[in-house]
Every structure is written in structure tokens, then in C-alpha cells.
Amino acid sequence: MASAGMQILGVVLTLLGWVNGLVSCALPMWKVTAFIGNSIVVAQVVWEGLWMSCVVQSTGQMQCKVYDSLLALPQDLQAARALCVIALLVALFGLLVYLAGAKCTTCVEEKDSKARLVLTSGIVFVISGVLTLIPVCWTAHAIIRDFYNPLVAEAQKRELGASLYLGWAASGLLLLGGGLLCCTCPSGGSQGPSHYMARYSTSAPAISRGPSEYPTKNYV
């Protein structure tokens, strides 16, 4: 019973992590710069993301520009893009592996095989969490290094954007969820599959509610 509950919690956390990761990768808020001129009229905020940059004027008007050439982009930005996409795909793969081994599915009948699949999915989610963490920490490190570099001009200095915090949250949720799935797999078990089917059916809607907790309209 506890094992099933931990599995549900684990997969819900990883789904929330995946959604967080998706939002983090998509939003142009990795680096934030505030340019304040002599007059408040020219005050503007620049948001930089993996795919585009946006300028928000003091009037509230926002203009976004998608980065043109892939080859012209800095290597660290290309790497961050790649890692973000890979992390999301790896997490999706983890979800498929989990679904194949979940106690409420009939893809695999044998209990040991199911347990192994759930364990594998947990490991895959942990890997996804680590992959999410790398570009976020790398970008944060660069921002902090610039902040303390006396030869980097004030206008070139950035602040940590909301996407980085979302990325850390995503990584944490994927690591925690994956860890829980790894912990719920002692081989063998006395409960029958029908028992869990009932438990899962009542919990299923909770999964679909996860993403709505992050209102992306606030960010874009």
C-alpha cells in the first residue's frame, strides 16, 4: 500500500518537474538585465532565454526576437538548448518506462519485471533531473561570475531570471520523484494488481491537475 502511494507521489512529482522544465526551457527569462537611463522613460528590462530575447519598456510594451542563426549562437547557449531538450525527452522516456511497469498496467505481467521497469524509470528521471540541472547551474555560475568581475561593465551584468528558479525546481522534482520511484521497488509483493487498479483510478486526475499550478501567463 505504502509502495503504491510512493509510486503515485513519485510520478506526480516527476510530471510536475517535467512541466516545470518545459516552462523553464521555453521562457525567455534565463538572464534578466535592467537598463535604467537618466530618465525613467527610457527604463527597460531585457529578458534573455534559450530561444529568444525580449525587451520590456517602462510603458509595459514587450518586443521579442527569436535568435536567428543557430551557428552564430554562443556554444554555451547551444549546449544549454541541447541539454534542455534532451532532459525533457529523457523524462518522457522515463514516463513511458514507468507506464510499462506501473502496477495498474498490464503491459508486463511479471511482478519482478514490473519492479525493474519502475526502478529503471526512477533512474531515468534522476538522469533527466541531472541533465536539467547542468544548463541551469552553468548559466547561474556565468551570471554570478560576471557580477563579481570588476572588468565586466554594469550594463553587461545580468541577474538570475525566473527560468533558472523554475529549472532548479524542475530538477529537484525530477530527482525527488525519480528517487521515490527507485525506493518503491523491493522485488515481489503480496498485493494483487486489481487492488492497485482501484487506487490508481482515483488518483489519476491529480496528475492532470499538476501543470495548472504554474500559470505561465504570468511570465510571458
Epitope: 554562443p74 554555451d76 556565468a142 568581475n149 570588476p150 572588468l151 565586466v152 561593465a153 554594469e154 550594463a155 553587461q156
Partner: antibody, heavy 119, light 107 residues
Framework: EVKLVESGGGLVKPGGSLKLSCAAS????????MSWVRQTPAKRLEWVVT????????YYPDSVKGRFTISRDNARNTLYLQMSSLRSEDTAMYYC????????????WGQGTLVTVST | DIQMTQSPASLSASVGETVTITCRAS??????LAWYQQKQGKSPQLLVY???LLVDGVPSRFSGSRSGTQFSLKINSLQSEDVARYYC?????????FGSGTKLEIK
């Protein structure tokens, strides 16, 4: 117009001390990072020291750490470089430099003051 | 310490020609590189920062580029007033170091 005028250079014996000054004018001194860079007789440029706008943080290369001290007086719009335990390899033209809000690196250079360490 | 290897040490070209000065960092410095110009008897002047960005007032015939740890300063349509020493400098981490300089002359 940004103006940086260095003074205090001269001939000094090895092991001796010297204090360089840099008088800044034409801009508000407080908000800017300031540095000293020297140019050896062989025309090589060497970064000497940097001080943050408030003066709270200072940055030195190992070659001068413990021997040179940078300071600033924001009220007097003046930058200082106290040099002690001078060596012959410290012989150089010393430039006072101001950073910039928009540009990275050493944005504005003074005309320099010559320091000669010799017996 | 990060070493900056600048080449060539000296360069002679005709007015109107295109010249390129290169600078290689001994390790990764991202785009934390500046170029300076020093005319005879004068102090150095900042030309380029962040490896590619030109300082206001610098003629557009000057351009900076980066490929990994190799950086270049290109001068298109060389003018007589471009006669000077050119230095690269990294500001990735302390200590900040300069290249040995390139002396540019007109033929």
C-alpha cells in the same frame, strides 16, 4: 570629458617605496571601477590592480600582492597606488584607468607616470 | 594563469588592404576579450570588448571575431591613421593578462 592625471612617479632604489596619485575630473568619480595598468620598457602591458566603485573590493595579481596597495578617496576624486619593496621589474609607465558603465575592460586611460626602479 | 599568445609581432601592409591580428588564449575565456590600440606616444585606447562589440566612435572597418579560444581583430581598408600597436586582453578571471602586442605599419 573624462580626464585622468597621474603623478608621483620618479626614480627609486630597489626596496624603496613610492605613492602614485591619479586625479580624476570631468565625470562623477564614485560609481566607477578604477585600475592601474603598467607598460614595461619592452612595451608589454601588465595589469597591476583594480578597485571597486565603493573601494570595498580590491583585486591584485600575485606579482604585486602584499607589496602594492590601491585606495581611493571619492570625496577628493583621487585614486592612489602605494608601492613598497620595489624591484627593478616594477620599472614601467603606470596608467590610471577608469571603467565604464557600457563597456567591459579598461575603458579610459590617463597619460601615465613613469616609475624607474634602479640603483 | 591564462596566457594570451598574439601574432604576428609586427605587420606591414598598404593603405586599403585588409589585415588580421590574432590572439589565442591558453584556455577557455568565453568571449571575455578586449582589443586596444596604442598610437605612438599615446595611451592605449579600448577598441573592442566582449570579443566582437565595438566601442562607440571606433570606425566600422574594425571588427572582432571569436572561434573557440582564438580571437581576431580585422581591419578592413587600412588607413594611415591605423598605424599603432594593438593588444588583446582577457578578463575572464584574475589575473587579467595582455597579449604581447602587434606593431602595425604602413608599407
Amino acid at each position: 570629458e573624462v580626464k585622468l592625471v597621474e603623478s608621483g612617479g620618479g626614480l627609486v632604489k630597489p626596496g624603496g617605496s613610492l605613492k602614485l596619485s591619479c586625479a580624476a575630473s570631468g565625470f562623477t568619480f564614485n560609481p566607477y571601477t578604477m585600475s592601474w595598468v603598467r607598460q614595461t620598457p619592452a612595451k608589454r602591458l601588465e595589469w597591476v590592480v583594480t578597485i571597486s566603485s565603493g573601494g570595498g573590493r580590491t583585486y591584485y595579481p600575485d606579482s604585486v600582492k602584499g607589496r602594492f596597495t590601491i585606495s581611493r578617496d571619492n570625496a577628493r576624486n583621487t585614486l592612489y597606488l602605494q608601492m613598497s619593496s620595489l624591484r627593478s621589474e616594477d620599472t614601467a609607465m603606470y596608467y590610471c584607468i577608469r571603467g565604464d558603465y557600457r563597456y567591459d575592460g579598461f575603458a579610459y586611460w590617463g597619460q601615465g607616470t613613469l616609475v624607474t626602479v634602479s640603483t | 594563469d591564462i596566457q594570451m599568445t598574439q601574432s604576428p609581432a609586427s605587420l606591414s601592409a598598404s593603405v586599403g588592404e585588409t589585415v588580421t591580428i590574432t590572439c589565442r588564449a591558453s584556455e577557455n575565456i568565453d568571449s571575455y576579450l578586449a582589443w586596444y590600440q596604442q598610437k605612438q606616444g599615446k595611451s592605449p585606447q579600448l577598441l573592442v570588448y566582449a570579443s566582437t562589440l565595438l566601442v562607440d566612435g571606433v570606425p566600422s572597418r574594425f571588427s572582432g571575431s571569436r572561434s573557440g579560444t582564438q580571437f581576431s581583430l580585422k581591419i578592413n581598408s587600412l588607413q594611415s591613421e591605423d598605424v599603432a600597436r594593438y593588444y588583446c586582453q582577457h578578463y575572464y578571471s584574475i589575473p587579467y593578462t595582455f597579449g604581447s602586442g602587434t606593431k602595425l605599419e604602413i608599407k
